[in-house]
């Protein structure tokens, strides 16, 4: 009699994550009597994937009715494939007995799974830095297969070169992750700047995935201070202004000191934004000259974004 053949016609099958995979298997003879089982992997550590007789395999269905008389098609369909399903699947014929005895295995079908990378997530520094300092941004994307992937960084459309990128794991795996760090030199003009991490992969339909971060979250632009005196008014009052310019973020507290004593404290709020994203603020202090015998030392003290206070002083001359 002709020797039983277990035929797995495809050496390899490739599917996209989320799709179904059909693994074909036919036998050349109904004899000897005995079940067919599907395994992933070979040898003692192999994993049972499908057994018609018993077990619960919610994602696996038989393509044709295996209970039908004279059925010789033992193909299976695995639904909702994930990268973890990758591997070599074997269709194995057993001879009925107590226990059943393995008789013949098919040549195996390698299941390869292609999976898209997750949307890149870009994170910036935990604390703000000032212009002329370098900060690091990190971009991460996970779950893709195959391993080949390209990642590029851009700042305002210009590609960044100070970049370090790793794809893990280094060896063979069902899926991979990428992590990249870009170092960005901040300038005072960067409040409206944006960094973009762009990930390209074979599974993406031509358009890279992008993750973005705004440099406004990472930058602190310290203010310039200027104290000036307006001309004396008829009522012997002098208007002194403290101009606080080009600062970011808006969080700012201004204190006026007269001869070292606190005169008034103000908090910046609802300021109009400059074109470059920074803010300006002007505070006025009226000084009654006739109430003073000596010159008055006025100090405009600015505490910006929790940083140490910056002072600018001005002396108002009191004529004898």
């Amino acid at each position: 009699e002709e020797e039983l053949q277990v035929i797995q016609p495809e050496k390899s099958v490739s599917v996209a994550a989320g799709d179904s995979a059909t693994l074909n298997c036919t036998v050349s003879s109904l004899i000897p009597v005995g079940p067919i089982q599907w395994f992933r992997g070979a040898g003692p550590g192999r994993e049972l994937i499908y057994n018609l007789k018993e077990g619960h395999f919610p994602r696996v269905t038989a393509v044709s009715d295996p209970t039908k008389r004279n059925n010789m098609d033992f193909s299976i369909r695995i639904s909702n494939i994930t990268p973890a399903d990758a591997g070599t699947y074997y269709c194995v014929k057993f001879r009925k007995g107590s226990p059943d005895v393995e008789l013949k295995s098919g040549a195996g079908t390698e299941l390869s799974v292609r999976a898209k990378p997750s949307a890149p997530v870009v994170s910036g520094p935990a604390v703000r830095a000032t212009a002329e300092h370098t900060v690091s941004f990190t971009c991460e994307s996970h779950g893709f297969s195959p391993r080949d992937i390209t990642l590029k960084w851009f700042k305002n459309g210009n590609e960044l070169s100070d970049v370090q990128t790793n794809v893990d794991p280094a060896g063979k795996s069902v899926s991979y992750s990428i992590r990249s760090t870009a170092r960005v030199l901040l300038t005072r003009r960067d409040v409206h700047s944006q960094v973009i991490c762009e990930v390209a992969h074979v599974t993406l339909q031509g358009d890279p995935l992008r993750g973005t971060a705004n440099l406004s979250e990472a930058i602190r632009v310290p203010p310039f201070l200027e104290v000036t005196q307006q001309s004396m008014r008829a009522d012997n009052q002098v208007n002194v202004t403290c101009q606080v310019t080009k600062f970011y973020p808006q969080r700012l507290q201004l204190t006026w000191l007269e001869n070292g004593n606190v005169s008034r404290t103000e908090m910046a709020s609802a300021l109009p934004e400059n074109k470059d994203g920074t803010y300006n603020w002007t505070s006025w202090l009226l000084v009654n000259v006739s109430a003073h015998r000596d010159d008055v030392k006025l100090t405009c003290q600015v505490e910006h974004d929790g940083q140490p206070a910056v002072n600018k002083s001005f002396s108002v001359k009191v004529s004898a």
Partner: antibody, heavy 116, light 109 residues
Framework: VQLVESGGRLVQPGTPLTLSCTVS????????MGWFRQAPGKGLEYIGI?????SPYYASWVNGRFTISKTSTTMDLKMNSPTTEDTATYFC?????????????WGPGTLVTVSS | DIQMTQSPSSLSASVGDRVTITCRAS??????LAWYQQKPGKAPKLLIY???FLYSGVPSRFSGSGSGTDFTLTISSLQPEDFATYYC???????????FGQGTKVEIK
């Protein structure tokens, strides 16, 4: 799922010509599409692709000679200033469902002859 | 740009013969290689993608192998309908560009 090219004809050198690829059975917003050409008796040559969102990418040799664009059901290839070397059958094709590294559906092609 | 070198440029074979066509990339393309069959006046037809995966509906006598720079298309037993020109096509994941080999014409001996 079907692709059909149209617009191929005899054209004089320097006269712009637009070829169209009309698709049915799938959405152009879901797949990368490509243009290829084959000069008489020669091999296949890649011209460019357009991404699912409509961004075109070209082979390095194109240098502005072609422009790829698309609408909801057609993809166009504009030959900006054809020369006699552009005489060929032009094919459009769709990438496979698993990725952009291969093309599994092709149109029958449309013949462009550039001659004075 | 990547260059794809196909060999031989043509071959003569008989029905039932085993036919092997090779394709070499000028730099590694990992497994991003497809094989197409084209008959005169017709569009190319996909046979193999990702170097070794048989496209749906393609007879199992066609098989592909290789990775990196060296690839092979094998027809295990040539049939009358297999007389055609075969092209390899690469995709480079960094440049995201495509390149074809110059083609191999399989003729009847």
């Amino acid at each position: 799922v079907q692709l059909v090219e149209s617009g191929g004809r005899l054209v004089q050198p320097g006269t712009p010509l637009t070829l169209s690829c009309t698709v049915s059975g799938f959405s152009l917003s879901s797949y990368v599409m490509g243009w290829f050409r084959q000069a008489p008796g020669k091999g296949l040559e890649y011209i460019g692709i357009i991404s699912s969102s409509g961004s075109p990418y070209y082979a390095s040799w194109v240098n502005g000679r072609f422009t790829i664009s698309k609408t909801s059901t057609t993809m166009d290839l504009k030959m900006n200033s054809p020369t006699t070397e552009d005489t060929a059958t032009y094919f459009c094709a769709r990438v496979g469902p698993l990725g952009v590294d291969y093309f599994n559906i092709w149109g029958p092609g449309t013949l462009v002859t550039v001659s004075s | 740009d990547i260059q794809m070198t196909q060999s031989p440029s043509s071959l003569s074979a008989s029905v039932g013969d085993r036919v092997t066509i090779t394709c070499r990339a000028s730099q590694s393309i990992n497994s991003y290689l497809a094989w197409y069959q084209q008959k005169p006046g017709k569009a190319p037809k996909l046979l193999i993608y990702s170097a070794s995966f048989l496209y749906s509906g393609v007879p199992s006598r066609f098989s592909g192998s290789g990775s990196g720079t060296d690839f092979t298309l094998t027809i295990s037993s040539l049939q009358p309908e297999d007389f055609a020109t075969y092209y390899c096509q690469s995709w480079h994941y960094i440049s995201r560009s495509y390149t074809f080999g110059q083609g191999t014409k399989v003729e009847i001996k």
